[in-house]
């Protein structure tokens, strides 16, 4: 058992440009106070964890008002250390979280509004009974300057804080078996002290706290004989008496995990899966609750209002993981409809429409032609998010608004005249050349390549299109 | 300005069930979460069931199973069904809203609560 100890010594702004507006202002006074989690070990999977070394909160900083004009100074910290005391032997790598957070002090409605101002991460590794390790961690424009150390309580010692010791009985030497306990070159090291009740007969330890059984014995305490009446699971010598196979007393007998903790056997010993709220090696040391505030990035805390209770987070969107730590990337789910663009504000998703389509995931399908008139008898065309008109002759423009000069594009061939006309366009077509655009040439026998030209018209007559 | 006002509250005996009610009114903004948390005497307040805007629904492992949340988005109102009622139930039951403006940003709102008492 022992203590991890944390003393922020400073937090404001990093060195070099952006520094940061201050947190507080003399409309609405704060004060800061940190919050400090632990987790076994190095490996990424540690992120999903609760706190399982354990959590604390620091108490409220001076209230604070900013200077107006004045740059954020190093802010006003809370007095003390933050400590967080573990039961278990100290892992000597561990994950830290430390967040710096505002409370603001104005009228609010419903009670001061907390923001989380900064939040570190870091792995390291450690040995208790160290000296105070100091590290500068920065977060976008803060930084924040903070010492750490775990510490065993007597009796333990040790880097792992697992040994055990005690004042010498005598003078000069330590017992049968037992070394002096460096560095306290007085004390001697402790027999291990095993689970409390644990058969002196029957039982043995080799960690402290820990009872195994000898071969026929079992329960938490080694104080039960292992029935010979059933050979279902032979696992020990055979019983003289019955010739049955006695069951040896397997490391999950009599389930060692307390808290309904469920046991698994391992080549070594066993290995305890705990409920959520509990942890430990038997899953003994409970404590983790809402108080702790085991909820990351605006969870809430469901269930868990006192230690033999679990506890739930409830995420806000974007986040998820048994303590909304970890960040969903929502887009990748592909949320926006008919090629929108996705952004995740990480307060909200917003989907940018492309044209013609809107709606939150940009499902709906705008109809373009709605309350889309095209003037001048023009009818309007759907097509790929926009609209068009399809204009009557003799106008033109996206509305058919504009008159459109008919003889703009030269439609006459072979040198004709364009004449323009309130139905459209005439073309006077050059000798030798006739039709509606003066495309067909005349033959010199004066046949035509075309049927004969409706009566009243002569070859070479204006022939109005149509 | 969110107000809340519960209703529903009141004395049942053991295994009852009771109905309570949480209308908000103001402006809720649209990425939040209500529901209901209680404190008995001399307890730790504890949220009991939430449920988000966006339907997610939590409730506490001491009463799942007995407790179901549920929220109607267009009269901004949460419901909170209890069945089975024991005596440990007994406390002031508070309708509360967070309301998440960014992942380091949020307010909550809370009523002035109902009190569920559960006696022989």
């Known amino acids: 058992a022992g203590v991890f100890e944390l003393q922020i010594h400073s937090f404001g702004p990093g060195p070099g440009p952006g520094a940061p507006r201050s947190p507080c202002s003399a409309r609405l006074p704060c004060r800061l106070f940190f919050r400090v989690c632990l987790k076994p070990g190095l490996s990424e999977e540690a992120a999903e964890s609760p706190c399982a070394l354990g959590a604390a909160l620091s108490a409220r900083g001076p209230v604070y008002t900013e200077q107006p004009g004045a740059p954020a100074p190093d802010l006003p910290l809370p007095d003390g250390l933050l400590q967080v005391p573990f039961r278990d032997a100290w892992p000597g790598t561990f994950s830290f979280i430390i967040e710096t957070w505002r409370e603001e002090l104005g009228d609010q409605i419903g009670g001061p509004a907390w923001s989380l101002l900064a939040r570190v991460a870091g792995r390291r590794r450690l040995a208790a009974g160290g000296p105070w390790a100091r590290d500068i961690q920065r977060a976008g424009a803060w930084e924040l300057r903070f010492s750490y150390r775990a510490r065993c309580e007597p009796p333990a010692v040790g880097t792992a804080c697992t040994r055990l010791c005690r004042p010498r009985s005598a003078p000069s030497r330590c017992g049968p078996g037992l070394r002096p306990c460096a560095p306290l070159e007085d004390e001697c090291e402790a027999p291990l002290v095993c689970r409390a009740g644990c058969s002196p007969e029957h039982g043995f330890c080799e960690q402290p706290g820990e009872c195994r059984c000898l071969e026929g014995w079992t329960g938490p305490l080694c104080t039960v004989p292992v029935s010979t009446s059933s050979c279902l699971s032979p696992r020990g010598p055979s019983s003289a008496t019955t010739g049955c196979l006695v069951p040896g007393p397997g490391p999950c007998d009599g389930n060692p995990c307390a808290n309904g903790g469920s046991c698994s056997e391992t080549p070594r010993s066993f290995e305890c899966t705990c409920p959520r709220g509990f942890y430990g090696l038997r899953c003994e040391v409970s404590g983790v609750t809402c108080a702790d505030g085991p909820c990351f990035n605006g969870g809430l805390c469901v269930g868990g209002a006192d230690p033999d209770s679990a506890y739930i987070c409830h995420c806000p969107p974007g986040f998820q993981g048994s303590n909304c730590e970890k960040r969903v990337d929502r887009c990748s789910l592909q949320p926006c409809r008919n090629g929108g663009l996705c952004l995740d504000l990480g307060h909200a998703l917003r989907c940018r429409c492309r044209a013609g389509f809107a709606g939150p995931r940009c499902e709906h399908d705008l109809d373009d032609c709605a309350g889309r008139a095209c003037a001048n008898g023009g009818t309007c065309v759907e097509g790929g998010g926009a609209h068009r008109c399809s204009c009557a002759l003799g106008f033109g423009g996206r509305d058919c608004r504009e008159r459109a000069d008919p003889c703009a594009a030269r439609p006459c061939a072979h040198g004709g005249r364009c004449y323009a006309h309130f139905s459209g366009l005439v073309c006077a077509c050059a000798p030798g050349y006739m039709g509606a655009r003066c495309e067909f040439p005349v033959h010199p026998d004066g046949a035509s390549a075309l049927p004969a030209a409706p009566p009243g018209l002569r070859p070479g007559d204006p022939q109005r299109y149509l | 300005e969110v107000q809340l006002v519960e209703s529903g509250g009141g004395e049942v005996q053991p295994g009852g069930s009771l109905r309570l009610s949480c209308a908000a009114s103001?402006?809720?903004?649209?990425?939040?979460?209500m529901g209901w948390y209680r404190q008995a005497p001399g307890k730790q307040r504890e949220w009991v069931a939430v449920?988000?805007?966006?339907?997610?629904?939590t409730v506490a492992p001491s009463v799942k199973g007995r407790f179901t949340i549920s929220r109607d988005n267009a009269k901004n109102t949460v419901y909170l069904q209890m069945s089975s009622l024991r005596a440990e139930d007994t406390a002031v039951y508070y309708c509360?809203?967070?309301?998440?403006?960014?992942?380091?940003?949020?307010?909550?709102?809370e009523g002035q609560g109902t009190l569920v008492t559960v006696k022989p």
């Open positions: 509360g809203v967070r309301e998440w403006y960014s992942d380091s940003d949020w307010r909550d709102y």
């Open positions: 449920v988000s805007s966006d339907g997610r629904t």
């Open positions: 103001g402006s809720i903004f649209s990425i939040n979460a």
